[in-house]
Amino acid sequence: EQAPGTAPCSRGSSWSADLDKCADCASCRARPHSDFCLGCAAAPPAPFRLLWP
């Protein structure tokens, strides 16, 4: 976990002010509106059944 303004989060994660820690970019498929997703290069779309089973 990284504090903002220090070393960046590890590859595949991005800083979340809401969570106060680095968060997994993979989570952006499920939680695309999370603040940290803005820092993730590409949030892949959710499979159809995950959102609307």
Epitope: G12, D18, L19, A23, D24, C25, A26, S27, R29, A30, R31, H33, A42, P44, P47, R49, L50, P53
Partner: antibody, heavy 119, light 111 residues
Framework: EVKLEESGGGLVQPGGSMKLSCVAS????????MSWVRQSPEKGLEWLAE??????????HYAESVKGKFTISRDDSKSRLYLQMNNLRAENTGIYYC??????????WGQGTTLTVSS | DIVLTQSPASLTVSLGQRATISCRAS??????????MQWYQQRPGQPPKLLIK???NLDSGVPARFSGSGSGTDFTLNIHPVEEEDAATYYC?????????FGGGTKLEIK
């Protein structure tokens, strides 16, 4: 310290109903997806139901095996999760875990409450 | 539904050695970027505990002797060096779609 505490388990006759409760503390309950997971010797770990956030209009999802029989709900003001179970059968016997996850995994688990369906 | 098959069902590993547990999914649970597979540890009488999310990402507080790898349909949990406290049952779980499913578990014993 994160804590999830289930209650409401016990012995119920086949065809009966039961409502499980779970009270959460130590994390921002209203920002976490919540689920119920059952464990039994016969079927191992089974995800049963999930409820998402207010911003998702509290969307719910169920395993086929419990769809129409179980209802998951939450009360964010009380940091509580519920599972209403109707028309219970022997195969619903097991340990019921309350779980919370920021997304599509289970970060936090309660100690579980045991449900026994038997005559 | 996606079926997760774990192997072996049980294994015994000497203290300090490597434990390797496999999980095979009946269909791919990966995109080009991420894999939607988790690993949990369950000690006797306790609930499961999240170890690894998205195939490779260690949960906070989990010792670095645990590692996850794999993509597509084949995933692996490695523990090295194994310690006495690692005696437990380990489960994989996918989050590719609903319903989420778990593997049948692998019981690890330490000698």
């Amino acid at each position: 310290e994160v804590k999830l505490e289930e209650s409401g388990g016990g012995l119920v006759q086949p065809g009966g109903s039961m409502k499980l409760s779970c009270v959460a503390s130590g994390f921002t309950f209203n920002n976490y997806w919540m689920s119920w997971v059952r464990q039994s010797p016969e079927k191992g770990l089974e995800w049963l139901a999930e409820i998402r956030l207010k911003s998702d209009n509290y969307a719910t999802h169920y395993a086929e095996s419990v769809k129409g029989k179980f209802t998951i709900s939450r009360d964010d003001s009380k940091s509580r999760l519920y599972l209403q179970m109707n028309n219970l059968r022997a195969e619903n016997t097991g340990i019921y875990y309350c779980t919370g996850g920021f997304a599509d995994y289970f970060d936090y688990w309660g100690q579980g409450t045991t449900l026994t369906v038997s005559s | 539904d996606i079926v997760l098959t774990q192997s072996p069902a049980s294994l015994t590993v000497s203290l300090g050695q490597r434990a390797t547990i496999s999980c095979r999914a009946s269909q791919s649970v990966s995109t080009s970027s991420y894999s939607y597979m988790q690993w949990y540890q369950q000690r006797p009488g306790q609930p499961p505990k999240l170890l690894i999310k998205y195939a490779t990402n260690l949960d906070s507080g989990v010792p670095a002797r645990f590692s996850g790898s794999g993509s597509g349909t084949d995933f692996t949990l490695n523990i090295h060096p194994v310690e006495e406290e690692d005696a437990a049952t380990y489960y994989c779980q996918h989050s590719w779609e609903i319903p989420y499913t778990f593997g049948g578990g692998t019981k690890l014993e330490i000698k």
